[in-house]
Amino acid sequence: FTVTVPKDLYVVEYGSNMTIECKFPVEKQLDLAALIVYWEMEDKNIIQFVHGEEDLKVQHSSYRQRARLLKDQLSLGNAALQITDVKLQDAGVYRCMISYGGADYKRITVKVNAPYRKINQRISVDPATSEHELICQAEGYPEAEVIWTNSDHQPVSGKRSVTTSRTEGMLLNVTSSLRVNATANDVFYCTFWRSQPGQNHTAELIIPELPATHPPQNRTH
């Protein structure tokens, strides 16, 4: 008796839904009375499906109302675990343990990404020095580097600072500021840079005509 996995690594987005799968051999019709399926992560019990019954009493609180076994898939030899509203804490190694005549298990690794998509920006000016402070703030995971460039996409020199804090959902709240001497209509870009492809997000900041503090904008691309 052998359990197999179509994929042993899933990279999923924070807040999305995921379905991870383990396959087991079923000849002709599924005998529910002989089937036991456990899904667990470390020692957290996610699914306990024994002889056709799911026992929610033993389900770990962090998965309550979010995890379910797709029972219509069992007859196809597919023990599929669906988790909705994926959290950062859902990252880790999952195990499907299946007993159906024989017993076997397989491991599945889940990684959770939260792209720094929504970049909030602010521009303020010091009237005394005409120095502008450009600020970009976004939430995501894991750590991102913030890169400042000019309209030619060249690195900008200037005094910069970065602060990082945690949100309630354990995302990283990253705020980067850059102090530069600039004139009206100069264009700057802040890029939240991550090493994985497709994980970079950039906001465009345009120095306004009037030396005033502007409300947050959400212009990103």
Partner: antibody
Framework: DVQLQESGPDLVKPSQTLSLTCTVT?????????WHWIRQFPGNKLEWMGY???????NYNPSLKSRISITRDTSKNQFFLQLSSVTTEDTATFYC????????????WGQGTLVTVSA | DIVLAQSPATLSVTPGDSVSLSCRAS??????LHWYQQKSHESPRLLIK???QSISGIPSRFSGSGSGTDFTLSINSVETEDFGMYFC?????????FGSGTRLEIK
């Protein structure tokens, strides 16, 4: 901290059944993980024998399948090994162990107990 | 069953030397290979999991590499406490199996 301790007879006669107990402290055997029996023969060769999952599902080494049984007593936080029809070839140090948090490897081991099969 | 062949059977070294221990699988096991150290009259202790992942509390002089069928445990500058037996273990398929071991001894 998780601790495991094997206990049982030092000497078993050929054709008899070898019975060992693993007593676990610091963690409930029903809370999670697989709980294994592993033996080490004179000469150091290690052999995985089988496990009992926290749900009581078992899986055994096919080379022992007809002779081995792993059971448990949750009230005492113990799990047991029974190996029937032993021969002198079954003389070994027997270890109980618990897998690691991401499975597949053995994180916690008992100190081992030597069982000699001899007439 | 997957057979793990360890070599050499015995390695005689002087403290301060750096050494490499080999474990070769009879078929591909991806990275499902773990290394243990066993000192005389003690239980095995995990050193490296999944071929190269370090373990909390294990000195950084121990490192692992390899994938597929060929794996190496490296000890950078052996210390006297490192002498003993070293075993590899595969978890790719049942039954889990161990290598026959490499004895690291003082020259």
């Amino acid at each position: 901290d998780v601790q495991l301790q094997e206990s049982g007879p030092d000497l078993v006669k050929p054709s008899q059944t070898l019975s060992l107990t693993c007593t676990v402290t610091g963690y409930s055997i029903t809370s999670g993980y697989n709980w294994h029996w592993i033996r080490q023969f004179p000469g150091n060769k290690l052999e995985w024998m089988g496990y009992i999952h926290h749900s009581s599902i078992t899986n055994y080494n096919p080379s022992l399948k007809s002779r081995i049984s792993i059971t448990r007593d949750t009230s005492k936080n113990q799990f047991f090994l029974q190996l029937s029809s032993v021969t002198t070839e079954d003389t070994a140090t027997f270890y109980c162990a618990r897998e690691g948090y991401d499975y597949d490897w053995f994180a916690y081991w008992g100190q081992g107990t030597l069982v000699t099969v001899s007439a | 069953d997957i057979v793990l062949a360890q070599s050499p059977a015995t390695l005689s070294v002087t403290p301060g030397d750096s050494v490499s221990l080999s474990c070769r699988a009879s078929q591909s096991i991806s990275n499902n290979l773990h290394w243990y150290q066993q000192k005389s009259h003690e239980s095995p202790r995990l050193l490296i999991k999944y071929a190269s992942q370090s373990i909390s509390g294990i000195p950084s002089r121990f490192s692992g590499s390899g994938s597929g069928t060929d794996f190496t445990l490296s000890i950078n500058s052996v210390e006297t406490e490192d002498f003993g037996m070293y075993f590899c273990q595969q978890s790719k398929s049942w039954p889990f199996t161990f290598g026959s071991g490499t004895r690291l001894e003082i020259k």
